[in-house]
Interface confidence: low
Amino acid sequence: HTAAQDNCTCPTNKMTVCSPDGPGGRCQCRALGSGMAVDCSTLTSKCLLLKARMSAPKNARTLVRPSEHALVDNDGLYDPDCDPEGRFKARQCNQTSVCWCVNSVGVRRTDKGDLSLRCDELVRTHHILIDLRHRPTAGAFNHSDLDAELRRLFRERYRLHPKFVAAVHYEQPTIQIELRQNTSQKAAGDVDIGDAAYYFERDIKGESLFQGRGGLDLRVRGEPLQVERTLIYYLDEIPPKFSMKRLTA
């Protein structure tokens, strides 16, 4: 009898194929699309998740326009190139040899170019602002209760260290969650804020990436918190490089 569980699945990533071929006959899972072995005790990187999603493509979602210096994911879904650690490669290209540079969450941070485009390094997204609008409720949520519940969610569901949840702001009906994580702050084993934000985004949209868990049931003192709009802004350690035409558009 080996150490493999009867139910060989990946709790943190349903977009995997699993078999008991790991050490000691243990359950080991590989991401769809890339075939990379994933660590099912923590979140799978956004790059591998996007690649898996593209291996079973769905309709691309429409995303909002950027606001000021923050980046918003306008380009929707694409099939990314991931490095051996599952991170986004700094340069991404499509099948027609159009290339662009991305940040650590895979969002484009330069104008599109050709194969001669250089992306010297993967620029880290160190600040993520998740902007939510909740559905009308009888009254406003208590700010401190809301703050505690969202911090608990990121700690327990996404295993994000509490120190990376910088702030939770609330002005009914708008909730803003600030995630901050500099390169120097992120230790080995720490969940990346970009990955946590992506899992949260998918949870909010009712597209949970977790295996077999129910969808996200967010409650504040028993009152359901239902989100009707989500915007996510990404701020990089090095400002993005877009042409003036793009910035004034």
């Epitope: 139910n7 050490p23 359950c27 005790s41």
Partner: antibody, heavy 119, light 112 residues
Framework: QVQLQESGPGLVKPSETLSLTCTVS????????VNWIRQPPGKGLEWIGV???????NYNSALMSRVTISVDTSKNQVSLKLSSVTAADTAVYYC?????????????WGQGTLVTVSS | DIVMTQSPDSLAVSLGERATINCKSS????????????LAWYQQKPGQPPKLLIY???SRESGVPDRFSGSGSGTDFTLTISSLQAEDVAVYYC????????FGGGTKVEIK
């Protein structure tokens, strides 16, 4: 929050069967495995066995002939039985939750229960 | 079965000084697929259950002070306490989970 609590008789006679129960709360036994570990007084930790979330078990090869671990998911309980006990089985017995689907670490432990084997 | 050997058995270190505990496994604990080492470190104080400090050989559990760090790969691993505090007096255990589970014999850390 996640909690585990061991319970059972504190005194067992030699040659009899030691029976302990680990009652859990804050998580589902269909999602996480539960391990039994023991520690003789003044000595180190010894892993006894595991009840995986899928319902299968594995045991320490040195104890395999005497150990049975079972689960009652409706009661949120995992039970340990150790037969033909001797004084060498006197120990604090702990249950601990697997924090990973393939059993990489134990982040949550019960407080432990001391079992003495003596006539 | 995988055998885990810890050294030293006990260690006396002055407050503020570095404490280093070694753990050696009888076979490699590195999973080439996930590139993770199946090794954890625990701290146990008298009358208490063990507390998880480090998993995957070098990942610090949430809430564990950053003076605790784990390193190593394959068969040789180290737990380091960079600046020993009075509350760090305890017994430390390594544990493999590459093939089921085995604990090391423990290292008692005391203040010199």
């Amino acid at each position: 929050q996640v909690q585990l609590q061991e319970s059972g008789p504190g005194l067992v006679k030699p040659s009899e069967t030691l029976s302990l129960t680990c009652t859990v709360s804050g998580f589902s036994l269909t999602s996480y495995g539960v391990n039994w570990i023991r520690q003789p007084p003044g000595k180190g930790l010894e892993w006894i066995g595991v009840m995986w979330a899928g319902g299968s078990t594995n045991y320490n090869s040195a104890l395999m002939s005497r150990v049975t671990i079972s689960v009652d998911t409706s009661k949120n309980q995992v039970s340990l039985k150790l037969s033909s006990v001797t004084a060498a089985d006197t120990a604090v017995y702990y249950c601990a939750r697997d924090e990973n689907w393939d059993g990489a670490w134990f982040a949550y432990w019960g407080q432990g229960t001391l079992v003495t084997v003596s006539s | 079965d995988i055998v885990m050997t810890q050294s030293p058995d006990s260690l006396a270190v002055s407050l503020g000084e570095r404490a280093t505990i070694n753990c050696k496994s009888s076979q490699s604990l590195l999973n080439s697929g996930t590139r993770k080492n199946y090794l954890a470190w625990y701290q146990q104080k008298p009358g208490q259950p063990p507390k998880l400090l480090i998993y995957w050989a070098s990942s610090r559990e949430s809430g564990v002070p950053d003076r605790f760090s784990g390193s190593g790969s394959g068969t040789d691993f180290t737990l380091t306490i960079s600046s020993l505090q009075a509350e760090d007096v305890a017994v430390y255990y390594c544990k493999q989970s590459y093939n089921l589970f085995t604990f090391g014999g423990g290292t008692k850390v005391e203040i010199k």
